[in-house]
């Protein structure tokens, strides 16, 4: 079937990091620098992704895989495939229009990036408050009142952290 | 708040320069490159180049090769973009933007009018 | 140098109208298409990053998506501030390049 396949197309037996050119008898030329294919057969090469100011290079382009891209220090990626860098905040903090903000009383941040969430409501759950919310913490809910009776374990685990949600800016 | 404020409009003679200013604040001037792109009347968007306000390095469009210097003053989070040898169809409004990967804030414009 | 082709070039539409523009690169850019909205005499705005990302402030009437060569832009119900041009734009290698426009006027 191969031989079959590269007698109707000379281009299927192209490997990745060439790419079958036209304008020399089909012949597999290898992709020019700062390009790539991934797959073999391939008519063109692909530009590759440029990591420059805010980004930084986590993988170098090579002729058969692209470059990837990270944001540099004090950054964070937002975004498919880090299509975008945000600034990054301290925990107890979340970035508004106007720079980096301290959560309001009753919301937190334990990361430096994304925005302030609620403490967890306890009594929702039935439950007490353990330890208290900071501005980087949550609270850590404990077994309600009526819990305490003798012989009772005195901590609950608090509920798995949440992902937390961020702002796309 | 992130701002980006430009010089004011300018009019200038064919075979002049221009030299349109872009203060940056808000931000760390130097985390983030600064991209001019230009809008003639009535027209779409065109990239010019950008500026590493980081280290200075710059990549102008093919078009404005010869024609155009970015360049910055880190003292005073300032870019600068110059256009020499101006014809008329130069005549356009100049932005600069913040490049966070995609172009996150803009200045106001600068409207270059290009006439003898 | 990456070319965006974006259509329609212009359209008419009513309040609360579902729009949908769309942008064709002539090479993979993986996800690195951004769209921005401009009202004259004003400058560019940021709408959508890496393709279907909004950005803080944003209605999220306003949604992105596609990924390689083909992507879209999409209003949901058509406000009246809605009525603008439109541009795509890639940010995955310089020389950065826009799509030229689409023009959204009311019926």
């Known amino acids: 079937f191969e031989r079959t396949r590269s007698l109707q197309d000379p281009c299927s037996n192209c490997p990745a990091g060439t790419f079958c050119d036209n304008n020399r008898n089909q012949i597999c030329s290898p992709c020019p620098p700062n390009s790539f294919s991934s797959a073999g057969g391939q008519r063109t090469c692909d530009i590759c992704r440029q990591c420059k100011g805010v980004f930084r290079t986590r993988k170098e382009c090579s002729s058969t895989s692209n470059a990837e891209c990270d944001c540099t220090p004090g950054f964070h990626c937002l975004g498919a495939g880090c299509s975008m860098c945000e600034q990054d905040c301290k925990q107890g903090q979340e970035l508004t229009k106007k720079g980096c903000k301290d959560c309001c009383f009753g919301t937190f941040n334990d990361q430096k990036r994304g925005i302030c969430r609620p403490w967890t409501n306890c009594s929702l759950d039935g439950k007490s408050v353990l330890v208290n919310g900071t501005k980087e913490r949550d609270v850590v809910c404990g077994p309600s009142p009526a819990d305490l009776s003798p012989g009772a374990s005195s901590v609950t685990p608090p509920a798995p952290a949440r992902e937390p949600g961020h702002s796309p800016q | 708040q992130v701002q980006l404020v430009q010089s004011g409009a300018e009019v200038k003679k064919p075979g002049a320069s221009v030299k349109v200013s872009c203060k940056a604040s808000?931000?760390?001037?130097?985390?983030?490159?600064i991209n001019w792109v230009r809008q003639a009347p009535g027209q779409g968007l065109e990239w010019m180049g950008w500026i590493g306000t980081y280290n200075g390095v710059t990549n102008y469009a093919q078009t404005f090769q010869g024609r155009v210097s970015m360049t910055t003053d880190t003292s005073t989070s300032t870019a600068y973009m110059e256009l020499r040898s101006l014809r008329s169809d130069d005549t356009a409004v100049y932005y600069c933007a913040r490049d966070a990967g995609p172009l996150d804030y803009w200045g106001q414009g600068t409207l270059v009018t290009v006439s003898s | 140098e990456i070319v965006l082709t974006q259509s329609p070039s212009s359209l008419s539409a009513s309040v609360g109208d579902r729009v949908t523009i769309t942008c064709r690169a002539s090479q993979s850019i993986s996800s690195y298409l951004n769209w921005y909205q401009q009202k004259p005499g004003k400058a560019p705005n940021l709408l959508i990053y890496?393709?279907?990302s909004l950005q803080s402030g944003v209605p999220s009437r306003f949604s992105g998506s596609g990924s390689g060569t083909d992507f879209t832009l999409t209003i949901s119900s058509l406000q009246p501030e809605d009525f603008a041009t439109y541009y795509c734009q890639q940010s995955y290698t310089t020389p950065y390049t826009f799509g030229q426009g689409t023009k959204v006027d009311i019926k």
């Open positions: 890496g393709a279907s």
């Open positions: 808000g931000y760390t001037f130097t985390s983030y490159d």
